[in-house]
Amino acid sequence: TPEVWVQVQMEATELSSFTVHCGFLGPGSISLVTVSWGGPDGAGGTKLAVLHPELGTRQWAPARQARWETQSSISLALEDSGASSPFANTTFCCKFASFPEGSWESCGSLPPSSDPGLSAPPTPVPILRADL
């Protein structure tokens, strides 16, 4: 069964910067990835970025840069302009759409005990995976 993993990292150098990493584990080619925060897109969440493998990416503040890392994983850099960081306890959701198989989505948040200096890079395992 295909799965989606989500990992949220705080940047060690800038505590106001966060990166969301998402990946799709399964067969099929990805047609579209939607990243949202505060819940899934369509269920109270706010769209942050949409990534298409051929037509490019679209992003909305506070998203800074959305990009493909591999054919089945993406990263989204976020810039927190406020003094206090609302990202720390926010849920980020990624939805991968593959034609004609369908869509898979998962959500994750920054681990509560996150030490910015110890943030591990994303690995192809379902980290903080919570299928909706």
């Epitope: 034609f99 004609p100 869509s103």
Partner: antibody, heavy 120, light 107 residues
């Protein structure tokens, strides 16, 4: 303007074969996922077969697997549905449709349909 | 496969009435639901995608809502030209499936 025009339908004997075609115009055919949807005499809609824009990933309704083949000819902007070992339950109005990635794969344009009747 | 149960099957209304059609999925389909309109003698046309987004040229009297398993399609002020069959459709998980349709008739 986006246009999809189906042809190839008709009356066919039980166990017979038929090839449906759909000529696309008004958009970059190779960039879109395409499918064949049928409407049964009871007016029920069924997605029969679909093909990814990469022309590799395909989908078939369980009841047509092994009997129907979806393909496309990029040079001729044409989508095909080869149907064989036809059964009475294949009697329907067959539509070709385009899928839009940004619309959650909704079918944003449909052809006018071509009728297939399987008789004994 | 995911079953889309659409109700009611028939609706007889007067012009100006508000109409609501519901679609219930047998499991969550996220927001991957579309609504189509099939007028007599015509092929289906896309009205709504991602539940609540109107397709190009669709009048704003048509609205959609819902998430997960329960979806609603509303025509706020029915007009004579809305005489048609309406279908819901889930493209969340293969095999993609349609509701049974709602035939809207105008008194």
């Amino acid at each position: 303007d986006v246009q999809l025009v189906e042809s190839g339908g008709g009356l066919v004997k039980l166990g017979g074969s038929l090839k449906l075609s759909c000529v696309a115009s008004g958009f970059t055919f190779s960039s879109y996922h395409m499918s064949w949807i049928r409407q049964t005499p009871e007016k029920r809609l069924e997605l029969v077969a679909a093909i990814n824009s990469n022309d590799i990933n395909t989908y078939y309704l369980d009841t047509v697997k092994g009997r129907f083949t979806i393909s496309r000819d990029i040079a001729k902007n044409t989508l095909h549905l080869q149907m064989s070992s036809l059964k009475s339950e294949d009697t329907a109005l067959y539509y070709c449709a385009r899928h839009e990635d940004y619309y959650g794969f909704a079918m944003d344009y449909w052809g006018q349909g071509t009728s297939v009747t399987v008789s004994s | 496969s995911i079953v889309m149960t659409q109700t009611p099957k028939f609706l007889l209304v007067s012009a100006g009435d508000r109409v609501t059609i519901t679609c219930k999925a047998s499991q969550s389909v996220s927001n991957d639901v579309a609504w189509y309109q099939e007028k007599p003698g015509q092929s289906p046309k896309l009205l709504m995608y991602y539940v609540s987004h109107r397709f190009t040229g669709v009048p704003d009297r048509f609205t959609g809502s819902g998430y997960g398993t329960d979806f609603t399609f509303t025509i706020n002020t029915v007009q004579a030209e809305d005489l048609a069959v309406y279908f819901c459709h889930q493209a969340y998980r293969s095999p993609w499936t349609f509701g049974g349709g709602t035939k809207l008739e105008i008194k």
